[in-house]
Interface confidence: low
């Protein structure tokens, strides 16, 4: 029995619902009473959802899963996962047994966009050319880990004297803090870009130092 799932990972935003597609080709005369369907976590074999003896056996995974009962008879064994969490990320296996048996695994990639970075400057007054300043770029509640890039007003990458830390909260979402230490020129703009590698989403922040006062666009 051929069981089909998408080759590419299913990308789902934290808090949204995701559909893990799985299909099979029922033979003529197929009845749901013949169907045994099991969804489980590929690594641990933990049961997620099942259908047997013509009945939806329900969710065994935090009561956040559902099948598409009206579509099962047409060979649609897809699983709906509600309110996706970071911890859901991983591989799910769809097992289908009628008279024959088949299985396939689909990957779930969880993502969350990063907030627009906030910029802080230390020290933030009485600045003169030649002073060393610390610019901190902070962006919150994204997933997975961000890539952080700094550049000056001319678009030249700044790679030296950058320290980036990422910490996860209880939901597994990351807060990113990137610190750039620079020696001030006569004036200058410093930008940080926080990129979500899965969503290919960029969040920008910048600070312009023009003697007095500073501006934070």
């Amino acid at each position: 029995l051929e069981v089909q799932v998408p080759e590419d990972p299913v990308v789902a935003l934290v808090g949204t619902d995701a559909t893990l597609c799985c299909s099979f080709s029922p033979e003529p005369g197929f009845s749901l009473a013949q169907l045994n369907l099991i969804w489980q976590l590929t690594d641990t074999k933990q049961l997620v959802h099942s259908f047997a003896e013509g009945q939806d056996q329900g969710s065994a995974y935090a009561n956040r899963t559902a099948l598409f009962p009206d579509l099962l008879a047409q060979g649609n064994a897809s699983l709906r996962l509600q309110r996706v969490r970071v911890a859901d990320e991983g591989s799910f296996t769809c097992f289908v047994s009628i008279r024959d048996f088949g299985s396939a695994a689909v990957s779930l990639q969880v993502a969350a966009p990063y907030s627009k970075p906030s910029m802080t400057l230390e020290p933030n007054k009485d600045l003169r050319p030649g002073d060393t300043v610390t610019i901190t770029c902070s962006s919150y509640r994204g997933y997975p880990e961000a890539e952080v890039f700094w550049q000056d007003g001319q678009g030249v990458p700044l790679t030296g004297n950058v320290t980036t830390s990422q910490m996860a909260n209880e939901q597994g979402l990351f807060d990113v803090h990137s610190v750039l230490r620079v020696v001030l020129g006569a004036n200058g703009t410093y930008s940080c870009l926080v990129r979500n590698p899965v969503l290919q989403q960029d969040a920008h922040g910048s600070v312009t130092i023009t003697g007095q006062p500073m501006t934070f666009p």
């Epitope: 976590l41 641990t44 970071v86 911890a87 880990e145 910490m167």
Partner: antibody, heavy 120, light 108 residues
Framework: DVQLVESGGGVVRPGESLTLSCAAS????????VSWVRQAPGEGLEWVSG???????YYADSVKGRFTISRDDSNNTLYLQMNSLRAEDTAVYYC??????????????WGLGTLVTVSS | EVVLTQSPGTLTLSPGERATLSCRAS??????LAWYQQKPGQAPRLLIY???TRATGIPARFSGSGSGTEFTLTINSLQSEDFAVYYC??????????FGGGTKVEIK
């Protein structure tokens, strides 16, 4: 063969700091989730902190803000930095591997543990 | 957090007898429960996961059952090496991962 070997335990005074290490072999530490679980003398097991394969960190409420879990992928080693230690932190600290990248799971491999004693 | 309550605290039995250990969850954890065995001076050892699945190398005399809030570990025909402390652990609702207080199985 999967092995976890803890080190760094010892006797410290309340308020002092200590760093525990867990050297892993037989698997790549950033491909699994790993936790610290402790056991006070004569008591049961208490999960302390965990870090997923992708670096997501979690802490029990009793240690949040005082303990920091980290790892060095190049040395395949897990750490637990323990600050502001209290008498109630006295325990054998075990390093335990989950059998999944995200660690909301059970532990299939454990180290032998290292004893931390906090006493004045 | 999910609180796991194990009973009895101590079980005194003879080799060859059957041991029945109970673990009760403060709310439903479906089947996300593991059992561990710990002997004095040793680390815990995984016995059962997903309520009923034996870990690699665990003898068939160990079996798990239950779902929701009530779980049981059964050891058929106790061997001398089975006398130890047994812990249950849930991984349904986390953090934190939580353990039961343990049941000591001792020789009569």
């Amino acid at each position: 063969d999967v092995q976890l070997v803890e080190s760094g335990g010892g006797v410290v005074r309340p308020g002092e700091s200590l760093t525990l290490s867990c050297a892993a072999s037989g698997f790549t530490i950033n491909s699994y989730a790993v936790s610290w679980v402790r056991q006070a003398p004569g008591e049961g097991l208490e999960w302390v902190s965990g870090i997923s394969g992708s670096g997501v960190r979690y802490y029990a409420d009793s240690v949040k803000g005082r303990f920091t879990i980290s790892r060095d992928d190049s040395n395949n080693t897990l750490y637990l930095q323990m600050n502001s230690l209290r008498a109630e932190d006295t325990a054998v600290y075990y390093c335990a591997r989950s059998n999944k990248v995200t660690w909301n799971n059970f532990f299939d491999y454990w180290g032998l543990g290292t004893l931390v004693t906090v006493s004045s | 957090e999910v609180v796991l309550t194990q009973s009895p605290g101590t079980l005194t039995l003879s080799p060859g007898e059957r041991a029945t250990l109970s673990c009760r969850a403060s709310r439903s954890i479906l089947t996300s429960l593991a059992w561990y065995q710990q002997k004095p001076g040793q680390a815990p050892r995984l016995l059962i996961y997903n309520t009923v699945t034996r870990a690699t190398g665990i003898p068939a005399r160990f079996s798990g059952s239950g779902s929701g809030t009530e779980f049981t570990l059964t050891i058929n025909s106790l061997q001398s090496e089975d006398f130890a402390v047994y812990y249950c652990q849930q991984y349904y609702d986390w953090p934190p991962l939580t353990f039961g207080g343990g049941t000591k199985v001792e020789i009569k």
